[in-house]
């Protein structure tokens, strides 16, 4: 057991197995469930994280249960197919050969079909609206302080460039964080807004994905900001294709 092995961890993803067996004895970490090598300097893609989550034995999960106020989107949990870069494949199917198309954050954007269903391209989610309700406080948070704190959080914890935090809206007790990132704006090395939103979602549920780090401790001018519910809305560059039957 060497010092190199002690250092060989993945700070940004605890759902990994790491060992110093990379090129030249360098540390290499692989995502659970897929075995894909991950870049531990940044966020792991949501697809690989969902795959790791589904592969973990139900009784051996190290993740904390969400508190009583957290809403769990059970529809959103499935064992996804990821491409070699860790992105969602445009078409997802379950074990019973039911298939559907997803966007870049893995959310279904068509009716379900069979194996003949075609999904021509992975449609990018370019606008994410995170809708939060905070627990009651003695007085409302100062809007500009709240704005600065959330921008700081997304930069420092989730590595997202501030230019992708389009706006922070606040009407006590509702906070809305708007993330925007077009295909043309996203450079190599930029964190994807979908991945940042997923890490944030898991953080506010008390299920941090970071290695050995304390949970999310959000404070605005020293006052704790405790989230009691989260809703996330996704807007794609191409509108989804659902039949009228689903809309009624």
């Amino acid at each position: 057991h060497t010092a190199a092995q002690d250092n060989c961890t993945c700070p940004t993803n605890k759902m990994t197995v790491c060992s110093p067996d990379g090129p030249g004895g360098r540390c290499q970490c692989r995502a659970l469930g897929s075995g894909v090598a991950v870049d531990c300097s940044t966020l792991t893609s949501k697809c690989l994280l969902l795959k790791a989550r589904m592969s973990a034995p139900k009784n051996a999960r190290t993740l904390v249960r969400p508190n009583e106020h957290a809403l769990v989107d059970n529809d959103g949990l499935y064992d996804p197919d990821c491409d070699p870069e860790g992105r969602f494949k445009a078409r997802q199917c379950n074990q019973t050969s039911v298939c559907w198309c997803v966007n870049s954050v893995g959310v279904r954007r068509t009716d379900k079909g069979d194996l003949s269903l075609r999904c021509d391209e992975l449609v990018r989610t370019h606008h994410i609206l995170i809708d939060l309700r905070h627990r009651p406080t003695a007085s409302a948070f100062n809007h500009s302080d709240l704005d600065a704190e959330l921008r700081r959080l997304f930069r420092e914890r989730y590595r997202l460039h501030p230019k992708f935090v389009a706006a922070v809206h606040y009407e006590q007790p509702t906070i809305q964080i708007e993330l925007r990132q077009n295909t043309s704006q996203k450079a190599a090395g930029d964190v994807d807004i979908g991945d940042a939103a997923y890490y944030f979602e898991r953080d506010v549920k008390g299920e941090s994905l970071f290695q050995g780090r304390g949970g999310l401790d959000l404070r605005v001018r020293g006052e704790p900001l405790q989230v009691e519910r989260t809703l996330i809305y996704y807007l794609d560059e191409i509108p989804p294709k659902f039949s009228m039957k689903r809309l009624t």
Epitope: A3, T16, C27, R152
Partner: antibody, heavy 122, light 109 residues
């Protein structure tokens, strides 16, 4: 714990060179960033590029360095910087430095090498 | 993005106080470091996180500020404090711009 740069010297204009940074007393296979920073004679400091030496090998480059400089880490004990199409403006002392955190956007340099002088002249 | 450091040079007597300012063109929270560099030597980290003293650095060095305005104050100046001081951030490294300030030469009379 220390860092040492090597590979500096006299290079002709339009020439190339490879600088190497080796660490002793610690392993590069950790969760931090290694940086190259340079300083022209009598001038200030400017960063060239960092590389993550944990799992992943992420890199960033200063705008002016893209295309001419390449940072890499092929082993757990060394980081290299390759430079091409050198001009007199690249004459400088080249330092390697270790970033103190695994987050590149919150990095400070808590360990520096003594530097190696690169002179570009015909 | 730009880091502007002032003044470029300052001269104070032994026992005096020097104040160096660094201004970021965008909010960088408290992600700022201060370095001391003497001729022929690499820089030495003095302060990180805008106000936290690095190991072994005397308490005469004090960092303050957050957001866009930062200050390094050196009190009870000693001859050994004669050096060039730099501020630095990596907050906007993905924009490819230099995160170092231009430097301040401190002369101790």
């Amino acid at each position: 714990q220390q860092l040492e740069e090597s590979g500096g010297g006299l290079v002709k204009p339009e020439g190339s060179l490879t600088l190497t940074c080796k660490g002793s007393g610690f392993d590069f296979s950790g969760t931090y960033w290694m940086w190259w920073v340079r300083q022209a004679p009598g001038k200030g400091l400017e960063w060239i590029a960092p590389i993550y030496v944990g799992s992943g090998s992420s890199t960033y480059y200063a705008s002016w360095a893209k295309g001419r400089f390449t940072i890499s880490s092929t082993s757990s004990t060394a980081v290299t910087l390759q430079a091409t199409s050198l001009t007199a403006a690249d004459t400088a002392t080249y330092f390697c430095a270790r970033g103190a955190t695994n987050n590149v956007f919150m990095n400070y340099f808590n360990l520096w090498g003594p530097g190696t002088l690169v002179t570009v002249s015909s | 993005f730009e880091m502007t450091q002032t003044p470029s040079s300052v001269s104070e007597p032994v026992g005096g106080t020097v104040t160096i300012k660094c201004q970021a063109s965008e909010d960088i929270s408290s992600n700022l470091g201060w370095y001391q560099q003497k001729p022929g030597q690499p820089p030495k980290l003095l302060i990180y996180g805008a106000s936290t003293l690095a190991s072994g650095v005397p308490s005469r060095f004090k960092g303050s500020g957050s957001g866009t305005e930062f200050t390094l104050t050196i009190s009870d100046l000693e001859p050994a404090d004669a050096a060039t001081y730099y501020c630095q951030t990596s907050y906007y490294i993905d924009d490819g711009v230099n995160g170092f300030g231009g430097g301040t030469e401190v002369v101790v009379k």
